[in-house]
Interface confidence: low
């Protein structure tokens, strides 16, 4: 006869491990007992359990409550055992020794491999600002046994670097994703993907990128110079910019206070019926936590009774 077992048994941490040991004998042969021991290299054999044809299952005190026979129906030639709730410390070499009648003893070894699936964590880097050089966007760490694979899934252009720390029974892998921040990255997902043989599917953690920026400011409303004449109603100037965080707007007049009747409504400056009093240099100040920008325009209100051309000067400054 011969013993049938597996070279390697792989289980996930916390699962039950079936350690197979089946004697395929000739007709009339019987298994008297099956002795299981742990036989790691450099250490003496540690008795695990004994399956006896007459006296039943005996379990070593060190494994009390953790070693069982598979549920019935059981083949009398099957010496397999179940190791409940596998932990990392269970990883190692095991030997099954079968005593048969009348053929004698047979033995076989197997290796138990306990997979410790990773628990990934994603840590965003420092605040991203447009104009920075290569900057850490996020780091992703996963610890498991064997070492997990940590990669990134994103449309964003960047570079990755990985390092690993080996512990006695596991390894931690940290991958960092670096990029040069630009406003186009705002709202883009950056996903850490962790692969491991103990996972049925990859674990994914997504971080949404936020890049602080402030666009140049400009003022709209003076495109048609002839509309800015005395008596015109509904004249307005609108300040254009964009940013992250969203910017706030402030209007001032460079050559004096804002004329009475002029309404400030966020990015818009609304005028009452125009008079020559409304001529002047108006400044839009745009700011957010990242930066600030100014744009100024010169308004020259035309008197239709005069035959002078209107001058408009647009200046943008940072």
């Amino acid at each position: 006869g011969e013993l049938e077992t597996s070279d390697v048994v792989t289980v996930v941490l916390g699962q039950d491990a079936k350690l197979p040991c089946f004697y395929r004998g000739d007709s009339g042969e019987q298994v008297g007992q099956v002795a299981w021991a742990r036989v790691d290299a450099g250490e003496g054999a540690q008795e695990l359990a004994l399956l006896h044809s007459k006296y039943g299952l005996h379990v070593s005190p060190a494994y009390e409550g953790r070693v069982e026979q598979p549920p019935p129906p059981r083949n009398p030639l099957d010496g397999s055992v179940l190791l409940r709730n596998a932990v990392q410390a269970d990883e190692g070499e095991y030997e099954c020794r079968v005593s048969t009648f009348p053929a004698g003893s047979f033995q076989a070894r197997l290796r138990l491999r306990v997979l410790v699936p990773p628990l990934p964590s994603l840590n965003p880097g420092p605040a991203l600002e447009e104009g920075q050089g290569l900057t850490l966007a996020a780091s992703c760490t996963a610890e498991g046994s064997p070492a997990p694979s940590v990669t990134w899934d994103t449309e964003v252009k960047g570079t990755t670097s990985s390092r690993s720390f080996k512990h006695s029974r596991s390894a931690a892998v940290t991958s960092e994703f670096h990029l040069v921040p630009s406003r186009s990255m705002n709202g883009q997902p950056l996903t850490c993907v962790v692969s491991h043989p103990g996972l049925l599917q990859d674990q994914r953690i997504t971080h949404i990128l936020h890049v602080s920026f402030l666009a140049e400011a400009s003022v709209r409303g003076l495109e048609d110079q002839n509309l800015w004449h005395i008596g015109r109603e509904g004249a307005m100037l609108k300040c254009l910019s964009e940013g992250q965080p969203p910017p706030s707007y402030n209007w001032t007049r460079l050559d004096g206070p804002l004329p009475s009747g002029v309404r400030v409504d966020g990015d818009t400056l609304g005028f009452p019926p125009l008079t020559t009093e409304h001529s002047g240099i108006y400044v839009c100040h745009v700011s957010n936590e990242f930066s600030s920008r100014d744009s100024q325009v010169t308004v020259d209100v035309l008197d239709p009774q005069e035959d002078s051309g209107k001058q408009v000067d647009l200046v943008s400054a940072s």
């Epitope: 410790v116 964590s121 760490t141």
Partner: nanobody, 120 residues
């Protein structure tokens, strides 16, 4: 059943220290990363610190770096948070947490929390 029980909170003056503990049961403690979170009144729960199963890797929120230290004793199934140089803005309910579940699902378990108040 996973159980997490925090203790060690209390009232402390600014600049003082506290040590929080989290006793864990119902899972193989040494195999799981653990974390501390906190929630101030009217604010969302925020990450404070985390530690890997072996204790070899730690992470901290910027706001507590250099002041708080996370540690664990796997022989006692206990997670700790040593908090020094406490500030009024550290006032919150502190929770310990574990993320478990391997076969495609991830489940967060939280303790009931312990109140930390920093006030003169």
């Amino acid at each position: 059943e996973v159980q997490l029980l925090e203790s060690g909170g209390g009232l402390v003056q600014p600049g003082g220290s506290l040590r929080l503990s989290c006793a864990a049961s119902g899972f193989t403690f040494s195999s799981y990363a653990m974390g501390w979170y906190r929630q101030a009144p009217g604010k969302e729960r925020e990450f404070v610190s985390s530690i890997s199963g072996s204790g070899g890797l730690t992470r901290y929120a910027d706001s507590v770096k250099g002041r708080f230290t996370i540690s664990r004793d796997n022989s006692k199934n206990t997670l700790y948070l040593q908090m020094n140089s406490l500030k009024p803005e550290d006032t919150a309910v502190y929770y310990c947490a574990v993320t478990t579940g391997y076969q495609g699902g991830v489940y967060d378990y939280w303790g009931q929390g312990t109140q930390v108040t920093v006030s003169s």
